[in-house]
């Protein structure tokens, strides 16, 4: 056969579906690889072919579209399972071709088991809600296209294992779940179970997502430098190790670029001919506010180093701040024993 543009195994779309539930999987060619859609391809005389490789096998085989009750079917660019079985797990390939053109892509499909509390190996999407921000909603994801708009499904929401009924600040509203005022206590996994009829059968769709309550943009402030500060003086003798921590608090801001850096005498530490090392650590609060600490270290400080200006800088999407560390040379204590002995002048 002629050469085929092979996009390989598209691991970006590691599709996971629950066992014994319907699944509709669109051929990724049209969504991510080709510049035309299925309708255009079909009207140009191109045919979409599906095949698969079972888990732990090397052999590509055609998909059996003649199973009882049309358990697996194809409709336009969608492969349908009504419902899935555990042994449907494998790598699926969709190939678009005619006599002069060929393009194909493979993707992994994993059929996953869940327990009665919806726990499973499924990778969960994370939805961030702002703390105490007013009404915010999450929507039951990935249920479009499973049933026509004329069908009215029943939707049940759960937090963890518990059906959401008479919760203080969480209200189910069909496909949406409304949080009247999000609090840390609302962190957790939320599941919607969508039940709908089709051809005399009842199907269930289970969708779980993780809700994470984060700092609100209303409360976001420019970076706050906790250290260095005016209360701590770094007093050292030449030859000692100088350690200055720069500790900066950053409010949570979605996708903000948070930066901490040191300057010495207004220059990059690299531009100063001293042996400086800087180590950074990062920690997060429950609302994903961030604390970055950069420790500036000079192993054997000289009297010249103790006269330099050490400034910690920080920047986020909210602004930029800087703070100088108070560094000074320790004054040696007077040697009283010698002075007193001389003072008494023994005869």
């Amino acid at each position: 056969s002629e050469r085929c543009d092979d996009w390989g195994l598209d691991t970006m779309r590691q599709i996971q579906v629950f066992e014994d539930e319907p699944a509709r999987i669109k051929c990724p060619l049209f969504e991510h690889f080709l510049k035309f859609n299925y309708s255009t391809a079909h009207s140009a005389g191109l045919t979409l072919i599906w095949y698969w490789t079972r888990q732990d096998r090397d052999l590509e085989e055609p998909i059996n579209f003649r199973l009882p009750e049309n358990r697996i079917s194809k409709e336009k660019d969608v492969l349908w399972f009504r419902p899935t079985l555990l042994n449907d797990t494998g790598n699926y390939t969709c190939m678009l071709r005619n006599t002069t053109y060929c393009s194909k892509v493979a993707f992994p499909l994993e059929v996953v088991q869940k327990d009665s509390c919806f726990n499973s190996p499924m990778k969960l999407p994370v939805h961030k809600l702002y703390i105490e921000y007013g009404i915010q909603r999450i929507t039951c994801p990935n249920v479009d296209g499973y049933f026509p708009s004329s069908v009215k499904p029943t939707i049940t929401w759960y937090m963890g294992c518990y059906k959401i009924q008479n919760f203080n600040n969480v209200i189910p509203e069909g496909m949406n779940l409304s949080f009247l005022i999000a609090l840390i206590s609302n962190n957790g996994n939320y599941t919607c179970v969508v039940t709908y009829p089709e051809n005399g059968r009842t199907f269930h769709l289970t969708r779980t997502l993780t809700v994470k309550v984060v700092g609100s943009p209303k409360n976001a402030v420019p970076p706050v430098i906790h250290s260095p500060n005016d209360h701590v003086v770094y007093e050292k003798e030449p030859g000692e190790e100088l350690l200055i921590p720069c500790t900066v608090y950053f409010s949570f801001l979605m996708d903000s670029r948070n930066e901490v850096w040191w300057t010495i005498d207004g220059k990059k530490p690299d531009d100063i001919t001293i042996d400086v090392t800087i180590n950074e650590s990062i920690s997060h609060s429950r609302t994903e506010d961030e604390t970055r600490t950069q420790i500036l270290s000079i192993k054997k400080v000289t009297s010249e180093d103790l006269k330099r200006s050490y400034v910690c800088h920080a920047r986020s999407a909210k602004g930029e701040v800087a703070k100088a560390a108070k560094v000074k040379q320790k004054v040696p204590a007077p040697r009283y024993t010698v002075e007193l002995a001389c003072g008494f002048g023994a005869t």
Partner: antibody, heavy 120, light 107 residues
């Protein structure tokens, strides 16, 4: 003198892979964030990815997530971009750039670019 | 993602003219903005960072101003060497979006 030189571009088929390299000299490489920026023919600039000084943080534009991997070798003072599942829309001049030290995020030194063409 | 909108997209001017290019961010980026100049077939060159800081070696006829969402690049007296494309770029948030560019051409 700061020098930034890209290499590794070329013609590749859709779905193929390519690894771009960026050799640098004249500055303390390990102290700077590094970045890749691309420019499709006749189009504007698009930030692609960047990597922190020690490689502990990497960020990507959405359109390349899962397909491109940025990496660095501080001993060799080099930056890399591994590109896979390439598409026609990845065709562009790829620039390697150093991010400014003071607060990072802007690009103060650029290479002359290496051209990547994705076509069957 | 933050959108950066530059205007105008093309600007016709003469040598000696005062030229102003504006850049608007879809949300506040504080002062996390840079401006670049690019000539055909060449790599971009940094002109301004932190909204108003002039990069060393850049002529003083270039200046930047603004904060939050509105920014401007001003060329006080356009020189023959200044006919080029100009881009703004925000770096307060990932990803580091560029404006679509402004081409300054000879009138």
């Amino acid at each position: 003198e700061v020098q930034v030189v890209e290499s590794g571009g070329g013609l590749v088929q859709p779905g193929g892979s390519l690894r771009l390299s960026c050799a640098t000299s004249g500055f303390t490489f390990r102290s700077y964030w590094m970045t890749w920026v691309r420019q499709a023919p006749g189009k504007g600039l698009e930030w692609v990815a960047n990597i922190k000084q020690d490689g502990s943080e990497r960020h990507y534009v959405d359109s390349v997530k899962g397909r491109f991997t940025i990496s660095r070798d501080n001993a060799k003072t080099s930056l890399y971009l591994q590109m896979s599942s390439l598409r026609a829309e990845d065709t562009a001049m790829y620039y390697c750039a150093r991010e400014g030290y003071y607060g990072s995020g802007y690009f103060d030194y650029w290479g002359q670019g290496t051209l990547v063409t994705v076509s069957s | 993602d933050i959108q950066m909108t530059q205007s105008p997209s093309t600007l016709s001017a003469s040598v000696g003219d005062r030229v102003i290019i504006t850049c608007r961010a879809s949300q506040s980026i504080s002062r996390g903005l840079a401006w670049y100049q690019q000539k055909p077939g060449k790599a971009p060159k940094l002109l301004i960072y932190k909204a108003s800081n002039l990069e060393s070696g850049v002529p003083s006829r270039f200046s930047g101003s603004g904060s939050g969402t509105e920014f401007t690049l001003t060329i006080s007296s356009l020189q023959p060497d200044d006919f080029a494309a100009y881009y703004c770029q925000q770096y307060s948030y990932y990803s580091h979006t560029f404006g679509q560019g402004t081409k300054v051409e000879i009138k």
